[in-house]
C-alpha cells in the first residue's frame, strides 16, 4: 500500500490499494481485478456454485456465506468430530445418522422404520399402507372398498384395522367345511323356518327367504290392525270368526244365541284348539237345528236367508279351521244327525272317499289346494239333516234348457208346489276355497227316503242368492242314476247339496231314472 | 288318562315370590288353554289367568296382572305361575286345570298349598 | 267383568229331594259351566255347556238356561251329592265363578 493515501470512496466489501485504486475482499470479486471508479461494486463469490474449486466431499452441503463458505454434513448425516462446519473434503468426517435408532417412534403405528443412507422409510405393516400427503404415516387399507374384491359373493367384507374379514351375510352360514371369516369363506343360506332360528308368531306360517325369512298368515288368518303381512313380526288374527254374525234384519233369539257360542269360541281361539272348535261349533250347530225355537216362526224367506247363511258360514268356518289340523281322517257325529267327515292330507295324488251314514262323496285330491297354497290340503263333507226344517218350501230355479226337457217328458208342475226334500243336506269344502268349476267332477251318493213313484228325482246344490238367501239349483249337477233309496249325483262344483223331488207326473217309463249303479 | 301333577305346599315370607308348576299328561299339552285358580280358606274359587303353552298368550284377571306370572315349557309338558310381592291374603290352594270355552275346566290338578306368613 | 250370582248361598236338603239352584250373570253368557266341590278336594267339573253332563256325572244332575239365567237340578238327592256347587262363565274376559252354593245335610 502507498504511504501517499488510500482512496475513500472505495466500494463495500473492497479495500483500497493507494490513493487512486481499490480491490475487492477476499471472497468477492468485481469486474476488473483493481477498481478505479467508485462505480464499480465488488459482489460476493459462490464458491459452492458448480464450477467452483471447492469440494466438501461426500454426504455435505456446501453452505455459500458473504464473503466465504461452509461445508456442513447433508442431513441424516453428522460429523464425527464433532464440528458443525469445515472447509474441504479432507476436513469431512460425515457419515450416515440411525434415526431408526434414535426415535423408535419415528414411523407411529402399523409402521416400521428402515435407515437408509441419509434418511429413513416407513415400511407399513400388511394391511397398511403410506398416507400420501404424510409418507411417514401408515393407515388402514379398505381392502372391502379398494376394489379387490376379496371375498366371495356369499359374503360381505367387514374391513378391521389391518386386516378384514369374509362373514356370511346375516341368514347365511359356511357351507360345511369352510370358515366363517378368513376370505376363503364360502357361505349358504340357512333355512330359519326348518332350523327353528325364526321369531314367527305362532299366528303365522315362516317363509324362508334367501338369507333371511318372512312371516305370513296362517290361512284363513289376517294380519292384526297395522300391522303388514309378510313382515318379520307380522301378527295376525283369525278371520274364521269375525265375519260369522246374525244374518242383518233376521230377530231371533236361538240364532243369537247360537252366534254368541261362535263368537266366544273365537274370541281364544288358537290353532291347537282347531278340532275341539270344530266340534263345538258343530255341536252348536245340531243343537240349534234340533230346537230352532223362535226360527220356526219366522217367515219362510227368512228361514232360507238364515240356512243359506248358515251354509255358507259353515263352509267358511270349517275350511278356515280344517287348516289348522294334524294330518288324519276326523269322523265327528251329533245327536239331531249332524256329521262330519274330514280327511287332511300332504298333498296326494289319489281319489278321496268321504263315507257318512247318508251320503258318500268322491273326488280328485289334486282338486283340494290351491296352488301356492302351503296348507295342507283338506276335503270335508258335513250332514246337516236338521237344515231340512229351515229350507222348507225352499225354491227350485231351473236353467231354461232343463226346464223345457222336463216339460217335453213331463206333463208338468203339479199344483202342489215346491219340490221335497229327500235327502240331508249336505256341505262339500275343500281347502281350496275356489270350487266354482272343478277340473274333476266330484261325485255324491245319497241314501234318502223311498221315492214316490212317477216324480222325478234331482239332484241339486244352494245357490247363494245377491239377496244373501238363495234357492235350489241343479246348474252344473247331473242325476246320474237313482233307486228308490238311493241316487248319485255329479257335480262340477262344490256347495251344499241335497236330493229333491219334483212334483212332475211322469207319462212314462222314464230311462233316465233307471238305476246306473 | 289326562294327569295335572302340581308341585309341594310352599311357606313364604311377605314380600316374596313363589313359583308353582303343573305338570300335564295323556294330552296334547297345546291343545288346551292352561287356567289357574286359587282358594283362599273358606272362600269360593278365584280365577287368576290362563297360559296358552301353544305359543306363550297369557290372560289374567286385572286383580293380578303385573303380579302374576304365566309361563309353560311345551318340551317338558308344564306350566308355571309365579306370584310376586306375597301378601298374607295370598295364603290359599292354587289350582291349575285344562280349559276349553265350550268345555269348561274338565280336568283339575291336586292344589298347591301357599302359605304366606312372616 | 260377567259377575255370577248363585243363590241361594247355603241351602239345606234331604236324600229324595228335588234340589234347584241358580246362576244369574250381569251380562249375557252363552257357555254356563258348573263344577262340584267337596271339602279339601279339588273341584270337578260337573255340568258343561249349560247342560251337557260331564263323564261319570249320573243323570239325576242336570242342567238348564240361558242369557242371564242358569239353573242347576238334582231330580233326587243323594247323600253323595252334598257339596259346594260353582258356576264358571268364560264368555268375556276375565273368567269368572260364581261364589258357590253350599248344599248341606237337612
Known amino acids: 500500500q502507498d504511504s501517499r493515501g488510500c482512496a475513500r470512496w472505495c466500494p463495500q466489501d473492497s479495500s483500497c490499494v493507494n490513493a487512486t485504486a481499490c480491490r475487492c475482499n477476499p471472497g468477492f470479486s468485481s469486474f476488473s481485478e483493481i477498481i478505479t471508479t467508485p462505480m464499480e461494486t465488488c459482489d460476493d463469490i459462490n464458491e459452492c456454485a458448480t464450477l467452483s474449486k471447492v469440494s466438501c466431499g461426500k454426504f455435505s452441503d456446501c453452505w455459500n456465506t458473504e464473503g466465504s463458505y461452509d461445508c456442513v454434513c447433508s442431513p441424516g448425516y453428522e460429523p464425527v468430530s464433532g464440528a458443525k462446519t469445515f472447509k474441504n473434503e479432507s476436513e469431512n468426517t460425515c457419515q450416515d445418522v440411525d434415526e431408526c435408532q434414535q426415535n423408535p417412534r419415528l414411523c407411529k403405528s402399523y409402521g416400521t422404520c428402515v435407515n437408509t443412507l441419509g434418511s429413513y422409510t416407513c415400511q407399513c405393516l400388511p394391511g397398511f399402507k403410506l398416507k400420501p400427503e404424510d409418507p411417514k404415516l401408515c393407515t388402514d387399507v379398505n381392502e372391502c372398498t379398494s376394489g379387490q374384491n376379496p371375498c366371495h359373493s356369499s359374503t360381505h367384507c367387514l374391513n378391521n384395522v389391518g386386516s378384514y374379514q369374509c362373514r356370511c351375510r346375516p341368514g347365511w352360514q359356511p357351507i360345511p367345511g369352510s370358515p366363517n371369516g378368513p376370505n376363503n369363506t364360502v357361505c349358504e343360506d340357512v333355512d330359519e323356518c326348518s332350523s327353528g332360528q325364526h321369531q314367527c308368531d305362532s299366528s303365522t306360517v315362516c317363509f324362508n327367504t334367501v338369507g333371511s325369512y318372512s312371516c305370513r298368515c296362517r290361512p284363513g288368518w289376517k294380519p292384526r290392525h297395522g300391522i303388514p303381512n309378510n313382515q318379520k313380526d307380522t301378527v295376525c288374527e283369525d278371520m274364521t270368526f269375525s265375519t260369522w254374525t246374525p244374518p242383518p234384519g233376521v230377530h231371533s233369539q236361538t240364532l243369537s244365541r247360537f252366534f254368541d257360542k261362535v263368537q266366544d269360541l273365537g274370541r281364544d281361539y288358537k290353532p291347537g284348539l282347531a278340532n275341539n272348535t270344530i266340534q263345538s261349533i258343530l255341536q252348536a250347530l245340531d243343537e240349534l237345528l234340533e230346537a230352532p225355537g223362535d226360527l220356526e216362526t219366522l217367515p219362510r224367506l227368512q228361514q232360507h236367508c238364515v240356512a243359506s247363511h248358515l251354509l255358507d258360514g259353515l263352509e267358511d268356518v270349517l275350511r278356515g279351521l280344517s287348516k289348522n289340523l294334524s294330518n288324519g281322517l276326523l269322523n265327528f257325529s251329533y245327536p239331531a244327525g249332524t256329521e262330519l267327515s274330514l280327511e287332511v292330507q300332504k298333498q296326494v295324488d289319489r281319489s278321496v272317499t268321504l263315507r257318512q251314514n247318508q251320503a258318500v262323496m268322491q273326488l280328485d285330491w289334486n282338486q283340494a289346494q290351491k296352488s301356492g297354497d302351503p296348507g295342507p290340503s283338506v276335503v270335508g263333507l258335513v250332514s246337516i239333516p236338521g237344515m231340512g226344517k229351515l229350507l222348507a218350501e225352499a225354491p227350485l230355479v231351473l236353467e231354461p234348457e232343463k226346464q223345457m226337457l222336463l216339460h217335453e217328458t213331463h206333463q208338468g208342475l203339479l199344483q202342489d208346489g215346491s219340490p221335497i226334500l229327500l235327502s240331508d243336506v249336505i256341505s262339500a269344502f275343500l281347502s281350496n276355497n275356489d270350487t266354482q268349476n272343478l277340473s274333476s267332477p266330484v261325485t255324491f251318493t245319497f241314501s234318502h227316503r223311498s221315492v214316490i213313484p212317477r216324480q222325478k228325482v234331482l239332484c241339486v246344490f244352494w245357490e247363494h242368492g245377491q239377496n244373501g238367501c238363495g234357492h235350489w239349483a241343479t246348474t252344473g249337477c247331473s242325476t246320474i242314476g237313482t233307486r228308490d233309496t238311493s241316487t248319485i249325483c255329479r257335480c262340477t262344483h262344490l256347495s251344499s247339496f241335497a236330493v229333491l223331488m219334483a212334483h212332475y207326473d211322469v207319462q212314462e217309463e222314464d230311462p233316465v231314472l233307471t238305476v246306473i249303479t | 288318562q289326562v294327569q295335572l301333577q302340581q308341585s309341594g305346599a310352599e311357606v313364604k315370607k311377605p314380600g316374596a315370590s313363589v313359583k308353582l308348576s303343573c305338570k300335564a299328561s295323556g294330552y296334547t299339552f297345546t291343545n288346551y288353554w292352561m287356567q289357574w285358580i286359587r282358594q283362599a280358606p273358606g272362600q269360593g274359587l278365584e280365577w287368576i289367568g290362563a297360559v296358552y303353552p301353544g305359543d306363550g298368550d297369557t290372560r289374567y284377571t286385572q286383580k293380578f296382572q303385573g303380579r302374576a306370572t304365566l309361563t309353560a315349557d311345551t318340551s317338558i309338558s308344564t306350566a308355571y305361575m309365579e306370584v310376586s310381592r306375597l301378601r298374607s291374603d295370598d295364603t290359599a290352594v292354587y289350582y291349575c286345570?285344562?280349559?276349553?270355552?265350550?268345555?269348561?275346566?274338565?280336568?283339575w290338578g291336586q292344589g298347591t298349598t301357599v302359605t304366606v306368613s312372616s | 267383568e260377567i259377575v255370577l250370582t248363585q243363590s241361594p248361598a247355603t241351602m239345606s236338603a234331604s236324600p229324595g229331594e228335588r234340589v234347584t239352584m241358580s246362576c244369574s250373570a250381569s251380562?249375557?253368557?252363552?257357555?254356563m259351566h258348573w263344577y262340584q266341590q267337596k271339602s279339601g278336594l279339588s273341584p270337578k267339573r260337573w255340568i258343561y255347556?249349560?247342560?251337557k253332563l260331564a263323564s261319570g256325572v249320573p243323570d239325576r244332575f242336570s242342567g238348564s238356561g240361558s242369557g242371564t239365567d242358569y239353573t242347576f237340578t238334582i231330580s233326587r238327592m243323594e247323600p253323595e251329592d252334598f257339596a259346594t256347587y260353582y258356576c264358571?262363565?268364560?264368555?268375556?274376559?276375565?273368567?269368572?265363578f260364581g261364589g258357590g252354593t253350599k248344599l248341606e245335610i237337612k
Open positions: 255347556d249349560t247342560s
Open positions: 286345570a285344562r280349559g276349553f270355552t265350550a268345555y269348561g275346566m274338565d280336568y
Open positions: 264358571q262363565q268364560w264368555s268375556s274376559n276375565p273368567l269368572t
Open positions: 251380562s249375557s253368557v252363552s257357555y
